[in-house]
């Protein structure tokens, strides 16, 4: 008896964070014997979506031509081959951007900032929103969520970072969202530009909090330290 | 609990100028921006513009450029208007208000009545 | 600029009776207005924002609703102590601005 079918590969290009109105596309890879790739939908009728095989049969695309709300979401795949339904694959959190107001981000006291020293970034919204997002571009695990406790909205969110190193330098946006739905974010706030100063021979920051630091900097770029300042917020890394 | 305490009522001479403070209390100063709002005689309000202490970035109604300059002092929690050129167009009650995130006005001060009178 | 044209400019009503104030802004500000209390001799007090949302400890007896460029304002069973000039504002866009405001007064 064969064991069970591998499981396939799921992804969105260009990426799984989408602005609203734009298009994306999800692939589906599985094996050269895949008869039919069906994708689902987490709190959706399954299927979403069937699709046959695009040749040489190892894979199946299916289309999103204009991005909005409905399509944010969780999504798996399968795939059928002549002895059944393979594994579903890890899912894919498709992301959709544009869905409120964009934020604010600001530095204090300043984006210039010295190493060794403290900044917060400091992300404000005009809408009332329960969870405060910040980005670091080109970091390999990029966001910090600051999230309220039991659903309160706040129009802002501190991030506190301290000591800053040479690591903590790059570009920074954040976005805003509601609880109900993680999938649907902000516009994103205007970039913020953090510019350190100082030793190039900083030690790393040195958490106060379990956060794992055994990746790379890039893998850990963000390392605030302290409370959240009486703002009814939880802080969540990813 | 949140309070802003504005200083008091100022009499003023045509061209002269002035300041007036909004001390705020019971919140973290530096990461809330400060309102600064206008209140002429027979008048509704108008917005002059706003400060963000924690980094001093500003924003001013065009309305208001070259008459009003913000400051802020985190050491003492207080903001500051500065009002120059005065003349009779700019008697009227300047309030401070503490905005929530970019959003609405939640604190207000009680006002600092301005007279210019020679 | 938006500008807020706030209606009535002044209303007397009864004690226990109901009043609706409306603002209609010159494009849509995405439920981004609040609505302020101004009694004399003080500074204004936040009553709704995001055009629904009921300040803490402000009584149920204030409401507000509307959508786009359409917002209203309502005040039922009426007490002694809602006279005052009331405002909405709207902060859809870097320049706040102030409706005109309504005097309320008890008949």
């Known amino acids: 008896q064969a064991g069970p079918l591998p499981k396939p590969t799921l992804w969105a290009e260009p990426g799984s964070v989408i602005s609203w109105g734009n298009s994306v596309t999800i692939w589906c890879q599985g094996t050269l014997e895949a008869r039919e790739y069906r994708l689902d939908k987490e709190e959706s009728p399954a299927p979403w979506d069937r699709q046959n095989p695009l040749e040489p049969k190892n894979k199946a695309r299916f289309s999103i031509p204009s991005m909005t709300e409905d399509y944010a979401g969780r999504y798996r795949c399968y795939y059928r081959s002549p002895v059944g339904w393979s594994q579903p694959s890890d899912p894919l959190e498709l992301v959709m951007t544009g869905a409120y107001s964009k934020p604010t981000l600001s530095a204090l006291p300043s984006p210039l900032v010295t190493s060794g020293k403290s900044v917060t970034l400091l992300c404000q919204s005009r809408s009332p929103m329960d969870t405060f997002l910040l980005i670091k571009e080109r970091a390999a695990h990029p966001l910090l969520h600051l999230r309220s406790e039991h659903g309160a909205q706040q129009h802002q969110a501190e991030f506190p970072m301290s000591p800053v190193t040479s690591v903590h330098g790059g570009t920074y946006r954040c976005f805003s969202s509601h609880g109900f739905s993680h999938y649907l974010l902000s516009h994103p706030s205007d970039p913020l530009e953090l510019i350190v100063s100082g030793s190039l021979e900083d030690p790393r920051p040195s958490p106060t909090r379990s956060v794992s630091t055994a990746a790379g900097p890039e893998d850990q770029p963000l390392m605030p330290t302290g409370s959240v300042p009486h703002s009814g917020l939880r802080r969540h890394w990813e | 609990q949140v309070q802003m305490q504005q200083s008091g009522t100022e009499l003023m001479k045509p061209g002269a100028s002035m300041k007036i403070s909004c001390k705020a209390t019971?919140?973290?100063?530096?990461?809330?921006?400060i309102q600064w709002i206008k209140q002429r005689p027979g008048h509704g309000l108008e917005w002059i513009g706003e400060?963000?202490?924690?980094?001093?970035?500003?924003n001013y109604n065009e309305n208001f450029k070259g008459k009003a300059t913000f400051s802020a002092d985190t050491s003492s929690n207080t903001a500051y208007i500065h009002l120059s050129s005065l003349t009779s167009e700019d008697s009227a009650v300047f309030y401070c208000a503490r905005r929530l995130g970019r959003g609405p006005f939640d604190y207000w001060g009680q006002g600092t009545t301005l007279t210019v009178s020679s | 600029d938006i500008q807020m044209t706030q209606s009535p400019s002044s209303l007397s009503a009864s004690l226990g009776g109901k009043v609706t104030i409306t603002c209609e802004a010159s494009?849509?500000?995405?439920?981004?207005i609040d609505w302020y209390q101004h009694q004399p001799g003080r500074g204004p007090s936040l009553l709704i924002h995001y055009a629904s949302i009921l300040q803490p400890g402000i009584p149920s007896r204030f409401s507000g609703s509307g959508s786009g460029r359409d917002y209203s304002f309502s005040i039922t069973s009426l007490e002694p102590e809602d006279i005052a000039t009331y405002y909405c504002?709207?902060?859809?866009?870097?320049?706040?601005?102030f409706g005109g405001g309504t005097k309320l007064e008890i008949k």
């Open positions: 400060i963000l202490p924690g980094s001093g970035t500003t």
């Open positions: 494009q849509d500000i995405n439920k981004h």
């Open positions: 504002l709207q902060y859809d866009n870097l320049l706040p601005t």
């Open positions: 019971g919140y973290t100063f530096s990461t809330y921006w």
